[in-house]
Interface confidence: low
């Protein structure tokens, strides 16, 4: 009888991650007696994938019934393929030996390549907020794809960006790859509602790219503009002074009124009005009892927005411009009346 040959008919196969891979192997003789084993790789460091003697390996099933000695088909099916399974698989015939089985003959090998989808892109922005006109960096990461070829694009509100750098790692052969890209974006005051999108296209996605997004609302800080105005007299000896806080984002804002440099009242913004661009407006006012003042009053509206250094706007209130009621100042009330925002 002719010497046994181990035949692996497929030089290479390609399988999508999550599917099963069938590795074909037949022998031409039942002699010598001995088990078939499957290995990934060659040489001393090869990895045992299946051993006829040892029975069930969790992810490996045999195509034929290997409990029968007359079986000549030693093909195996590996389930739930992952990129880590990529490599060259060898079907190896062993001859019974003592104390160890002796390798008799190996097949030529079948190279298994795995097509793996990239993970959903994750876009992250800067750790701290930035103000309009500043340039901020966004990163996009996707992992676990194979083969290595991949395309990444950046968009801001649907418009493709060009200022970005992309790396695919590792540079050499690997079971799977990762992509990392950094894009630079110039913020504008209108960006509260803007989105930055990272789009990844890969052969495994069949023309339906994956997208990751970041909302610029998480990144931008639009500082407020302040305007302090004196309203017409609402009652005898009372003046209404308002502080308009306009076009700010995010909402977190604290306002302090000062009278000649002394704190009169501090309040936290509530009942904000939202502008179409996503920024907010707020107004606070004071009722000033001018009869309680002999001299002019400097009123200051001081605003601390989103933990940033305070900005302020002042208004000089001319006391002399208001007539005083005779005999009404013998027991004056508080100089500044507390007022709720509109």
């Amino acid at each position: 009888e002719e010497e046994l040959q181990v035949i692996q008919p497929d030089k290479s196969i390609s399988v999508a991650a999550g599917e099963s891979a069938t590795l074909h192997c037949t022998v031409t003789s039942l002699i010598p007696v001995g088990p078939i084993q499957w290995f990934r790789g060659a040489g001393p460091g090869r990895e045992l994938i299946y051993n006829q003697k040892e029975g069930h390996f969790p992810r490996v099933t045999t195509v034929s019934d290997l409990t029968k000695r007359n079986n000549m088909d030693f093909s195996i099916r590996i389930s739930n393929i992952t990129p880590a399974d990529a490599g060259t698989y060898y079907c190896v015939k062993f001859r019974k030996g003592s104390p160890d089985d002796v390798e008799f003959k190996s097949g030529a090998g079948t190279e298994l390549s795995v097509r793996a989808k990239p993970s959903a892109p994750v876009v992250s922005g800067p750790a701290a907020r930035a103000t309009p006109q500043h340039t901020v960096s966004f990163t996009c990461e996707s992992h676990g794809f194979s083969p290595r070829d991949i395309t990444l694009k950046w968009f801001k509100n649907g418009n493709e960006l060009s200022d970005f750098q992309t790396n695919v790692d590792p540079a050499g052969d690997s079971v799977s790859y990762s992509i990392h890209s950094t894009a630079k974006v110039v913020l504008t005051r209108e960006d509260v509602h803007s989105q930055v999108i990272c789009e990844v296209a890969h052969v495994t996605l069949q023309g339906d790219p994956l997208r990751g997004t970041a909302n610029l609302s998480e990144t931008i800080r639009v500082p407020p503009t302040l305007e302090v105005t004196q309203q017409p007299v609402r009652a005898e000896n009372q003046v209404n002074v308002t502080c308009q806080v306009r076009k700010f984002y995010p909402q977190r804002l604290q306002l302090t009124w000062l009278e000649n440099g002394n704190v009169s009242r501090t309040e936290t913004a509530s009942t904000l009005t939202e502008n179409k661009d996503g920024t907010y407006n707020w107004m606070s006012w004071l009722l000033v009892n001018v009869s309680a003042h002999r001299d002019d009053v400097k009123l200051t509206c001081q605003v601390e927005h989103d933990g940033q250094p305070a900005v302020s706007k002042s208004h000089d209130l001319k006391v002399s411009a208001h007539p005083k009621e005779q005999g009404s100042n013998t027991a004056p009330g508080p100089a500044l009346a507390s007022a709720a925002p509109l």
């Epitope: 003697k53 040892e54 029975g55 000695r69 019974k96």
Partner: antibody, heavy 118, light 107 residues
Amino acid sequence: EVQLVESGGGLVQPGGSLRLSCAASGFTFSSFDMHWVRQPTGKGLEWVSTIGIAGDTYFPGSVKGRFTISRENAKNSLYLQMNSLRAGDTAVYYCARGGNWDDALDIWGQGTMVTVSS
Amino acid sequence: DIQMTQSPSSLSASVGDRVTITCRASQDINNYLAWFQQKPGKAPKSLIYTASSLQSGVPSKFSGSGSGTDFTLTISSLQPEDFATYYCQQYNTYPYTFGQGTKLEIK
């Protein structure tokens, strides 16, 4: 020296449970399939269970659903958990190593006696 | 299940004799056959595996042969320590099964 030592046998009432242990030494335990074989007094040998190195298990119909086999490679130990015991399970229980490429039983322990009686 | 039938059930022989014990399987077991020796109160000892392969440390006076369904164990020259009960076992298909045993006694 390659050695297998069983323990855990004893007298148990019908319907009861018993857990047998087999301590292995002198070889790389995790690299071998392991077996339990029993022998009623004055009678022949009966295969009871096999556990492969990958944890795959096999039983004859006579004990399936009542016996479980397990192994703890880190402790070089083999176990046989026997539940719903019957008088017909009375026997000497041996553990054995599947030591050859084709899983022939090459090394046997000295055995432990299990008696099921009320 | 595969049935294993040994013959004879018992055998009387003298020291120096050559004896043969046979084992028949109810279906082809593809040479997955082992032979064991057991002495009273002792554990079985492996003699032969894969029908004809001698287990390490077993004297060459023991030999096995056969294929398919019919197998034999031969002891070429009996010694006093060889008087025991001998079992065959198939391990081709679960459940593994043993023959009923052959008791070899001194004549």
